[in-house]
């Protein structure tokens, strides 16, 4: 990178050059703030969406079991009941076989599982929505994380840790950006301040530039705002 | 030679002020922040503030405020401290630094000035 | 305000030994820090800044080490020149403060 501030004979610096007045801009790392926050927004979901899909497949897989528990409490239809230790023999007598032939289901205020094709496809076109909304938010993801724009066939795995990658190097740069900012805040890095830019930001700030006072210091003529922001891009 | 020269010692009584100065010389003085530090035997090394020589920013530790005025003259090279309300705790050296830890770093110490408050 | 703390305070070492001294900021300072030496009845030098970087001049036998909250400043075959006492300072934003000092003495 190229310091600002060049040595003379001796290691003095120089004075920058004016630079032409450029649009005010917020800097780099609230870009990468942003891109961090949709990447990491993108990976939840993606996460939530296949979550959820395990959850359904799970869901099918185990066909509601509908038949009285032991305790009277019916054990489909969501109740969660603690599971019972002592299993019961399972009486082969023909005699109650008969009975439990003859028991009538319906007065017990649920029907038998017999499986409507509506109500399948209905199910199938959820999951069917649901798939595609994982690979919207993988597809999604993908396009936000380094190469994976390019690289359609990257996995969902190779998504999610490229992802982690590219948010943790984002974290890191945020963390620069703190450090350097701080150091500008502390003095040890701000490069002296062309006369054409400060101009430039006087007459955006409005004249007369009022006196701006703080805890930290009494800021005369450039907010401390507009000098860290100034410095920022110096530094760049 | 890049130097930062300090005036001389100054004895001065409880209550009074003490204005000291830094002449840059080697190096333009408004290329870098000039930072104010101050050592004494109990609390070893103290930022009191830097300014901008540029453009005349300052900015103070807390504990200063009030107690120390940052200026400077950019026509002479010279940035001035002045130290008001002075009492015996302030009896130390102070020292003018030029400040600068970017790519190509600079940091130059003057020499110092003692400042001795006593009746 | 950021407390920075120098351990051991002091510290005897002969010519030619590798020593070894230790910076703790109170909070994540990230890489903000430098160690300046100073001589009895001098001003201080810079040695090292944004924690690893040597200022120019400066033997290579010195190294700066760590980030975050904890540093160290290493000299390697100590010179006759290098005893002295060794500061450390964050300039993790203001105000800037300086640690009480490791005093490095001739054994």
């Known amino acids: 990178m190229e310091s600002s501030a060049k040595m003379e004979s001796g290691g003095a610096g120089q004075q920058p050059q004016p630079q032409p007045q450029q649009p005010f801009l917020p800097p780099a790392a609230c870009f990468f703030a942003t891109a961090a926050a949709a990447a990491a927004a993108a990976a939840a979901a993606a996460a939530q969406s296949a979550q959820q899909q395990q959850q359904q497949q799970q869901q099918q897989q185990q066909a509601p079991q509908l038949r009285p528990a032991a305790d009277g409490q019916p054990s489909g239809g969501g109740h969660k009941s603690a599971p019972k230790q002592v299993k019961r023999q399972r009486s082969s007598s023909p005699e109650l076989m008969r009975c439990k032939r003859r028991l009538n289901f319906s007065g017990f205020g649920y029907s038998l599982p017999q499986q409507q094709p509506a109500a399948v496809a209905r199910r199938n076109e959820r999951e069917r929505n649901r798939v595609k909304l994982v690979n919207l938010g993988f597809a999604t993801l993908r396009e936000h994380v380094p190469n994976g724009a390019a690289n359609k066939k990257m996995s969902k795995v190779e998504t999610l840790r490229s992802a982690v990658e590219y948010i943790r190097a984002l974290q890191q740069l945020l963390d620069e950006h703190d450090a350097v900012s701080a150091a500008f805040q502390a003095g040890v890095l701000s490069p002296t301040i062309s006369p054409n830019y400060s101009n430039d930001l006087n007459s955006m700030a409005g004249s007369p530039v009022s006196s701006y006072s703080s805890d930290e210091g009494s800021y005369d003529p450039l907010s401390p705002e507009e000098q860290e922001l100034l410095d920022f891009t110096n530094w760049f | 030679e890049v130097q930062l020269l300090q005036s001389g010692p100054e004895l001065v009584k409880p209550g009074a002020s003490v204005k000291m100065s830094c002449k840059a010389s080697?190096?333009?003085?408004?290329?870098?922040?000039l930072h104010w530090v101050k050592q004494s035997h109990a609390k070893s090394l103290e930022w009191i503030g830097y300014i901008n020589p540029y453009n005349g920013v300052t900015s103070y530790n807390q504990r200063f405020k009030g107690k120390a005025t940052l200026t400077v003259n950019k026509s002479s090279s010279t940035a001035f401290m002045e130290f008001r309300s002075l009492t015996s705790e302030d009896s130390a050296v102070y020292y003018c630094v030029s400040l600068y830890y970017g790519d190509d770093p600079f940091a130059c110490w003057g020499q110092g000035t003692l400042v001795t408050v006593s009746t | 305000d950021i407390q920075m703390t120098q351990s051991p305070a002091s510290l005897s070492a002969s010519v030619g030994e590798t020593v070894t001294m230790t910076c703790r900021a109170s909070?994540?300072?990230?890489?903000?820090l430098a160690w300046y030496q100073q001589k009895q009845g001098k001003s201080p030098q810079l040695l090292v800044y944004?924690?690893?970087n040597l200022a120019d001049d400066v033997p290579s036998r010195f190294s700066g080490s760590g980030s975050g909250t904890q540093f160290s400043l290493k000299i390697n075959s100590l010179q006759p020149e290098d005893f002295g006492i060794y500061y450390c300072?964050?300039?993790?934003?203001?105000?800037?403060?300086f640690g009480a000092g490791t005093k490095l003495e001739l054994k």
């Open positions: 300072h964050h300039f993790y934003g203001s105000p800037l403060t």
């Open positions: 909070e994540n300072i990230y890489s903000n």
């Open positions: 944004a924690a690893t």
């Open positions: 080697g190096y333009t003085l408004t290329d870098y922040n």
